[in-house]
């Protein structure tokens, strides 16, 4: 499995998970692939406490999270239920805005500079956060 007993170097432990904060930028799909190659996934935000932790470590930067509606409904990359889970959208979001002129709407979610979420064009290059579970049982 992908669970670990301690976090890898340069990863930050919080509440049973390990987090890695990028310093470069990538489109959502490339960020998602990067996390998978690290046996992790784009961060799944499940609580206000986790949201606050992430904000403290990210700084005020647009940062991809593991939430997308590229397949229709909004879904977290690890299968966590979107409908019943924590949500922290900016007011008026998500809006699937077409006005950017790049074709299509907006299908990937990111932290904005104030930490609340926005949907944006998935191919925009933003920072990202990877997350993997920490196995405390071993």
């Amino acid at each position: 499995g992908s669970e670990r007993t301690c976090c890898p170097i340069n990863w930050v432990e919080y509440e049973g998970s390990c987090y890695w904060f990028s310093s470069s930028v990538r489109p959502w799909t490339e960020a998602d692939k990067y996390c998978q190659l690290e046996n992790a996934h784009l961060v799944v935000v499940t609580s206000r406490d986790e949201q606050n932790f992430l904000q403290r470590h990210m700084g005020p930067l647009n940062t991809w999270i593991g939430l997308t509606d590229q397949n229709g409904p909004w879904k977290w990359v690890d299968g966590t239920d979107y409908e019943t889970g924590f949500q922290n959208w900016r007011p008026e979001q998500p809006d699937n805005w077409y006005g950017h002129g790049l074709g299509g709407g907006e299908d990937c979610a990111h932290f904005t500079t104030d930490g609340r979420w926005n949907d944006d064009v998935c191919r925009r290059p933003y920072r990202w956060v990877c997350e993997t579970k920490l196995d405390k049982a071993n």
């Epitope: 509606d69 590229q70 397949n71 229709g72 409904p73 909004w74 979107y82 409908e83 949500q87 959208w89 007011p91 008026e92 979001q93 998500p94 809006d95 699937n96 805005w97 077409y98 006005g99 074709g103 299509g104 709407g105 299908d107």
Partner: antibody, heavy 117, light 107 residues
Framework: EVQLVESGGGLVKPGGSLRLSCAAS????????MNWVRQAPGKGLEWVSS????????YYADSVKGRFTISRDNAKNSLYLQMNSLRAEDTAVYFC??????????WGQGTLVTVSS | DIQMTQSPSSLSASVGDRVTITCRAS??????LNWYQQKPGKAPKLLIY???SLQSGVPSRFSGSGSGTDFTLTISSLQPEDFATYYC?????????FGPGTKVDIK
Amino acid sequence: EVQLVESGGGLVKPGGSLRLSCAASGFTFSSYSMNWVRQAPGKGLEWVSSISGSSSYIYYADSVKGRFTISRDNAKNSLYLQMNSLRAEDTAVYFCARGGSRGFDPWGQGTLVTVSS
Amino acid sequence: DIQMTQSPSSLSASVGDRVTITCRASQSITSYLNWYQQKPGKAPKLLIYTASSLQSGVPSRFSGSGSGTDFTLTISSLQPEDFATYYCQQSHSFPFTFGPGTKVDIK
């Protein structure tokens, strides 16, 4: 289960008005763009209007612009289409559907609007 | 506005046949092309989104391809329940537009 149910269709005279409703259930309604699509008897599909999750962005087909108004009430999980100055060519089955750039899914069962004197 | 055309407008086929329907956009829509199936008296059903992604629950005999202006829907082995009308739709930009449809009936 994700479900959309339209209502409000019926027979109306030319120049009259009608308000269609679409009741949504089984998903976080405010997170999704919603749409109206119509189909005249024996004809193909025609996109009518779209509205973003928070009503920030609204779009209309030229054929209905200035006559139809799309709106939503996220507290009631409902989508509406106010149709004014109706014409014979507006006769169609009207469908509501969820979604945007990744296609419309699901669709409601449709409600028939007949404009005739 | 982006115009969508489909060919053929109708076709007759037998169970087991391989069926191909084409859709053309009047300008590039990159991959923002969706395919729907509609049976008489029913609402349309999403089959393929963004040109080639199979909608959840749709049989794998349906596939889509193409990008830019030219797109194809293929049914690898036609089944009795596949006799219906098929529509393409662009979701690249507003106003969204549908193709005129292709009716697939029994030979």
